[in-house]
Interface confidence: low
Amino acid sequence: KLTIESTPFNVAEGKEVLLLVHNLPQHLFGYSWYKGERVDGNRQIIGYVIGTQQATPGPAYSGREIIYPNASLLIQNIIQNDTGFYTLHVIKSDLVNEEATGQFRVYPELPKPSISSNNSKPVEDKDAVAFTCEPETQDATYLWWVNNQSLPVSPRLQLSNGNRTLTLFNVTRNDTASYKCETQNPVSARRSDSVILNVLYGPDAPTISPLNTSYRSGENLNLSCHAASNPPAQYSWFVNGTFQQSTQELFIPNITVNNSGSYTCQAHNSDTGLNRTTVTTITVYAEPPKPFITSNNSNPVEDEDAVALTCEPEIQNTTYLWWVNNQSLPVSPRLQLSNDNRTLTLLSVTRNDVGPYECGIQNELSVDHSDPVILNVLYGPDDPTISPSYTYYRPGVNLSLSCHAASNPPAQYSWLIDGNIQQHTQELFISNITEKNSGLYTCQANNSASGHSRTTVKTITVSAELPKPSISSNNSKPVEDKDAVAFTCEPEAQNTTYLWWVNGQSLPVSPRLQLSNGNRTLTLFNVTRNDARAYVCGIQNSVSANRSDPVTLDVLYGPDTPIISPPDSSYLSGANLNLSCHSASNPSPQYSWRINGIPQQHTQVLFIAKITPNNNGTYACFVSNLATGRNNSIVKSITVSASGTSPGLSA
């Protein structure tokens, strides 16, 4: 069938269109093109005779048409009037006629649009704005863009006039944006330049900064005011209702208590005509004096005296604060505060109460601190210590003993031998001692301020013969693979060699054995059950030697994995079942049995007479060592066969 295709269908003014013929018949005489939907001689555009290849213009020929041998028609420099239908009339050689009609539409190239507005300075929450996209163009579609986005859905936005007009009702400051319109038709699309909507708003309620309202006398007051506004607000300051100045900032140097009052910032928008104010109340406080501490007892005696510390000066309606060692007061029954917190009482002072103590006066602005105060607590003397710790000396050496006792003020020392006063010194020195220097050596410490005295007595033995040593231990029952044990050979003697034996042998080389303290101490790390041996220490000097009695180490261990005997697991029905459980353990463990998970009895031996197949199952022995806190277990399966069915063993 003969058809006409328009390429393109929508044609821009000034461009060209091709009316393309499809299914053109064979053996043609010629063809003609007509404007319109039918053959009308008055509207013939062009005719073509194939035999002569002659094209003849018709009444509707405009000079812009070109006909091709394949019957297609090209129209150039398209104008608006070219829109419509075109008919091709084909005359075949047998003079039979055929017709086909095609069409196209002509659209203008759109100009760049622009936006007109009915209100260039709308007021927030009051005015509406209507934007119109110019020019008005037939067969054009109008689109709108806000900040290069399509229009948001909003009841305040309304399109009218075929979308050519965009109306914003009750504008807000958030409508301040870039607006563009776009025109479209089938052959072109153009977008306008941006129009920025300038919404007048504010002023909002101003904010005054900084936020603080309390100041000290002598400081500078510097207040700044800001209110959201378009155009920017004009500012005025009022103090206690009296106009001060028309500035955004208010600065008053070196303020006094008289500058306390209400400070008002007024913001004014000259375009909207609106005013808004904010008031802040400023309080200026006088500078308080620096506090100091007085004490009712500058030299209190430990465990006897109380001390009352008072924060000066006394000021009405003031909060007093206390600190000890830069910390707030600890909770203690020995610390008492007066009702107004001005007096801190320390009941029964100790040497640890020296301080430092600080008091503070809290005012509306800050805390003012006193200088720290330190208490001179009188204490001691504590029990004196005599060094060195040796108690055995050989004749001919020098004896030099020193005494020390904690005390404030420092203690005065005296030495007595067998109750007889010797000298008033901290150190006692006797050269070239003999057996006659053996005896009771007493150090007496005296505190002259408190009047207290304390003594310590030490027995000194001067002998060529060493005493029989003994072994002390820091752990009498160590646990295997867990504890360490330190043996110490007593006494500590001067110029003495210390020796050790284990089971009568000298010490084996082992990373778990360590000698220290001049070989006087033997440490066993990570003890094992094999360390349960006899330990002996010996002492010797150039004239004598002696050994201690043996000390046997009692190592707690286990329980190890238990063993159930006999090892048999198959029995004949009717036999007696007699199972015995054993686990290596010190002390001996506690035993218990479970059959198929059910607890049975707390014995080492489990006996069941005349067993049957019902006694089949798992037999578990549990062992526990209360001393080591460790547990262990083993499970054995027992099978009981009916008599004669399998070779069994009878218990």
């Epitope: 100041y215 400081e219 500078n220 602005l365 800050s366 805390v367 200088d371 720290p372």
Partner: nanobody
């Protein structure tokens, strides 16, 4: 004319450290109780720490105790704030101020501390 100039702020990762300084002039620094205060984005002012005139006594807000250390050098008229183990909630504009506790006197323009990974 009282002048306080803070410095030392910046961007730091959580757990990091910063040391803020405040150079003071125009008043008797050595006889003024000094404080650090801060203002987090969208929040009000928060007192951070205070120090007495000779530096012998310091106080801290619970939120920074054990992490921040305030100190001063009266010879240099300078206040310091050593900030360790910083957290994201420490992000704020930090001001040094004359006074402390419930109110403050003049303060500087602030230094911004941003704690972010």
């Amino acid at each position: 004319q009282v002048q306080l100039v803070e410095s030392g702020g910046g961007l730091v990762q959580p757990g990091g450290s910063l040391r803020l300084s405040c150079a003071a002039s125009g008043f008797t620094f050595s006889s003024s109780y000094m404080s650090w205060v801060r203002q987090a984005p969208g929040k009000g002012l928060e007192w951070v720490s205070g120090i007495n005139t000779d530096g012998s006594f310091t106080r801290y807000a619970d939120s920074v105790k054990g992490r921040f250390t305030i100190s001063r050098d009266n010879a240099k008229n300078t206040l310091y704030l050593q900030m360790n183990s910083l957290k994201s909630e420490d992000t704020a504009l930090y001001y040094c101020a004359v006074g402390g506790g419930l109110g403050y006197g003049p303060w500087g323009q602030g230094t911004l501390v941003t704690v972010s990974s």
